[in-house]
């Protein structure tokens, strides 16, 4: 038997993916475990294999269909179970009745690119991925810029309270290397959280012209 405290957390990406993390103190390392999804009103069910992400936590992605298909709604309830093999049978280790639109975490923004760069300014754009059409343009973003000699945690957060998929960074230092990240969040859902940060975009401001400041 497996003793210790267990935590089972899942998020819906608003389209066709439920990502889950299960952590268990004192869990058996060699046990094969999976997450099983049983919707209350759909004809499909889905399973994914839990893979270790640290000493005592495992993660997997339930792929419900094509990436941009709308597989769940606000009235769906999905019973999610962690099942671990014990000899010839499966044991239920954790269970939850999951309301997808109360537990949203969108995919990280993608396709970050520098639209235009100057000595003190840089215009950057991005795209959102696999976000439900239900949200329309009602999303918010947070962005941060990594300056030389600082850490990401020290970077001030810039908040965009609308679906604005670009930003103009100002008061930058000429001829300096920066990195930029952005994340997204819908308005809906009691337990909804920010998406992961995007992959960082590296860029360099232009050098100041000799004898003048631009």
């Amino acid at each position: 038997a497996v003793n210790g405290t267990s935590q089972f957390t899942c998020f819906y990406n608003s389209r066709a993916n439920i990502s889950c993390v299960w952590s268990q103190d004192g869990a058996l390392q060699d046990t094969s475990c999976q997450v099983h999804a049983w919707p209350d009103r759909r004809r499909w069910n889905q399973t994914c294999e839990l893979l270790p992400v640290s000493q005592a936590s495992w993660a997997c992605n339930l792929i419900l269909g094509a990436p941009d298909s709308q597989k769940l709604t606000t009235v769906d309830i999905v019973t999610l179970r962690v099942l671990c093999r014990e000899g010839v049978r499966w044991r239920v280790m954790a269970i939850q009745d999951f309301k997808p639109f109360e537990n949203l975490r969108l995919m990280a923004p993608i396709s970050l690119q520098v639209v235009h760069v100057e000595t003190h300014r840089c215009n950057i754009s991005w795209e959102i991925s696999q976000a439900s059409h239900y949200f329309e343009r009602h999303l918010e973003f947070e962005a941060r810029t990594l300056s030389p000699g600082h850490t990401w945690e020290e970077a001030p957060l810039l908040t965009l309270k609308q679906k604005q998929e670009w930003i103009c960074l100002e008061t930058l230092t000429p001829d300096t290397q920066y990195e930029f990240q952005v994340r997204v969040k819908p308005l809906q859902g009691e337990f909804t959280t920010w998406s992961p940060w995007s992959q960082p975009l590296a860029f360099r401001t232009k050098p100041a012209a000799l004898g003048k400041d631009t």
């Epitope: 709308q70 239900y134 819908p186």
Partner: nanobody, 119 residues
Framework: QVQLQESGGGLVQTGGSLRLSCAVS????????MGWYRQVPGKQRELVAD???????KYADSVKGRFSILRDSVKNTVYLQMSSLKPEDTGIYYC?????????????WGQGTQVTVSS
């Protein structure tokens, strides 16, 4: 402002049929589920049938095989075809729509339409 307009209720004999309809109109919205609930005196409102995006219908056990729900997402209208009606189907039938407005989901209700099944 969102409005739900129900119609089709009335008095019918046991074994008869009725067709309820409910149209949603008003400000810009996206509907992800529409359905019917009924209330009888002294009892809580209970689900009769609803249909969510992706065509997944849910029915109360007491109406399975007798009632069918149809949703027209283009017209934002939901229909309830009721046949083989019984006296216990009597009640006020309410339309409910789950709507997305400005990035948030809310439930909206109609005023209700009376269905009376006489024996």
């Amino acid at each position: 402002q969102v409005q739900l307009q129900e119609s089709g209720g009335g008095l019918v004999q046991t074994g008869g049929s009725l067709r309820l309809s409910c149209a949603v109109s008003g400000s810009r919205f996206i509907s992800d589920v529409m359905g019917w609930y009924r209330q009888v005196p002294g009892k809580q409102r209970e689900l009769v049938a609803d249909m969510a995006d992706g065509g997944s219908a849910k029915y109360a056990d007491s109406v399975k095989g007798r009632f069918s729900i149809l949703r027209d997402s283009v017209k934002n209208t939901v229909y309830l075809q009721m046949s083989s009606l019984k006296p216990e189907d009597t009640g006020i039938y309410y339309c409910k729509a789950g709507l997305w407005l400005a990035g948030r989901h809310s439930d909206y209700w109609g005023q209700g339409t009376q269905v009376t099944v006489s024996s």
